[in-house]
Structures are given as C-alpha cells and as structure tokens.
C-alpha cells in the first residue's frame, strides 16, 4: 500500500518542514527561509508571521511552526493568536476612543484591560454592603440586615486555643 500511495501521490511522503516542489519534479524540498509547513504533504510553505511594531516575538518561526507574537509592555493581546494589541489602562479605568477614562461612580475595573462593570447590588441577594466599592474594587456583600439584629454577630468568633498535647475537656 505504501509503495502504491507513493507512486500515486509523490507529495504524500513530504514531512512537515518541507514542501512538494513542482520546480524539482515534485520531490520534497526544505521550506525556504522565513517560511514553514506544519503538516506533511504540503505543496507550498507558509510565510512566517513577523512580530513588528507593538507586537514582539514570543516564539520564533521554525521550519515546522509559525512565529507567535505577544504585545510590548503597556499593551495586551486581543483576538485569536494575538491578532491585535490593545493599550493597557490602569485599574479603575477603561479604554475608550479618547483613551483611558476613569470608571464612572458605581462601576469598577480590577484589571488593566476590559470595561468598567457595575458594582454588585447586594440587596438583590438580600444582603447588605459590608465594604463599599471603589473604581478598582467591587463592593463586598455581608450578611442580610436581619442577621445583624441585636445580639447577632456578623463575625464568627475564633475557636478557643488549645494547649498542645491536651484533649478537650
């Protein structure tokens, strides 16, 4: 079968990193400089991606795999395979068409990317606000107001410390 297949399609035995070269009677030639083929049986090699400008090289191109890019400091990747680089903002900001803008009151962003999101509405879960939100942090919801009736504690007391080597009385 192997011999039959070879005679039918001389390109089928070309390994990754080579191409089936029409200029050389369809024998397998190594991929030219700055190109690659990631699978066998290819009739051409693909041009390597070049990481230029705001992109930087994360992985060099080889004869069997494309280069991989990421973004220079101050930018982050967007899209499949880091097809775009987008400017970072500070925590508490979001990127708009006019640049980085502070989050509006009632919203926050705890990352250098993405948009400002509304604070959690604690009352929707029947809870109260334990820690107020900021531009950088969401609110922290605490127990429901009913749990905070006189005599009820919102914090569980720590277990009493035991001396080592003694069993509880």
């Amino acid at each position: 079968f192997e011999r039959t297949r070879s005679l039918q399609d001389p390109c089928s035995n070309c390994p990754a990193g080579t191409f089936c070269d029409n200029n050389r009677n369809q024998i397998c030639s190594p991929c030219p400089p700055n190109s690659f083929s990631s699978a066998g049986g290819q009739r051409t090699c693909d041009i390597c991606r070049q990481c230029k400008g705001v992109f930087r090289t994360r992985k060099e191109c080889s004869s069997t795999s494309n280069a991989e890019c990421d973004c220079t400091p101050g930018f982050h990747c967007l899209g499949a395979g880091c097809s775009m680089c987008e400017q970072d903002c500070k925590q508490g900001q979001e990127l708009t068409k006019k640049g980085c803008k502070d989050c509006c009151f009632g919203t926050f962003n705890d990352q250098k990317r993405g948009i400002c999101r509304p604070w959690t509405n604690c009352s929707l879960d029947g809870k109260s606000v334990l820690v107020n939100g900021t531009k950088e942090r969401d609110v922290v919801c605490g127990p429901s107001p009913a749990d905070l009736s006189p005599g009820a504690s919102s914090v569980t007391p720590p277990a009493p410390a035991r001396e080592p080597g003694h069993s509880p009385q």
Epitope: N23, R24, P30, P33, S63
Partner: nanobody, 121 residues
C-alpha cells in the same frame, strides 16, 4: 558551481549502522540547505533529511529517531548517521545542495553521484 562527493555506503546487517559523508567544494558560501535523498530501484527519489545553514534539521517520518544529519563547517562536509538499519533502508543515497531562495525557486540545485546502501543478512 558546487561539487558534491558522497562516501560511506556499503553492505550492513539489519540493526547495524553506517555513516554517510557528503563533501562539498566550489561555491559553498551560497548553500542554504544540504539534503539527503534516497532512491530504491523502480521507486521515486525520497526525502530523508535536511540541514539548513542555520542548523535547522528535518527528517522523514520513516527515519526519525534512527538517522541523524549533521555538518562540519570546517570540513564543508554533511553527515548522515544511520542507526538501527532495516532492509527497507536499502537504496542509493544522494546528497543535494540547495542555493538561496529567489522567491519562487532555489537558485541552484546540485547533486552528488550517490552511494549505495544495502541492508541485508
């Protein structure tokens, strides 16, 4: 032009080893890749292994893990170390040099005369 002379072929038993050499002379400064091919009687010429001027190597699936291509720049020689040889490795082994890429094809393509490798008990 580039002249290529292969050596090191012969008769070897299955499981044995051979080292083929390909000595290059002439306009060797412009060589991009050195390639070993093999051709068994009545069959097409098959890619075995290649090494580029940058040292990148490629192997045919059928020889991966058994054959190693290397080069000695000082001697302008490319080697093919062949271990764990099998009867199906029997063929004439040809050395090939490829010049720089012009955007469509390799600028030149020179071949040695070949060296016979026979694997048989």
């Amino acid at each position: 032009a580039v002249q290529l002379v292969e050596s090191g072929g012969g008769l070897v038993q299955p499981g044995g080893s051979l080292r083929l050499s390909c000595a290059a002379s002439g306009s060797i400064f412009s060589i991009y890749a050195m390639v070993w091919y093999r051709q068994a009687p009545g069959k097409q010429r098959d890619f075995v292994a290649s090494i580029t001027s940058g040292g990148s190597t490629i192997y045919a699936d059928s020889v991966k893990g058994r054959f190693t291509i290397s080069r000695d720049n000082a001697k302008n020689t490319t080697y093919l170390q062949m271990n764990s040889l099998k009867p199906e490795d029997t063929a004439v082994y040809h050395c090939n040099s490829l010049g720089s890429w012009d955007g469509e094809r390799y600028e030149y393509d020179y071949w040695g005369q070949g060296t016979q490798v026979t694997v048989s008990s």
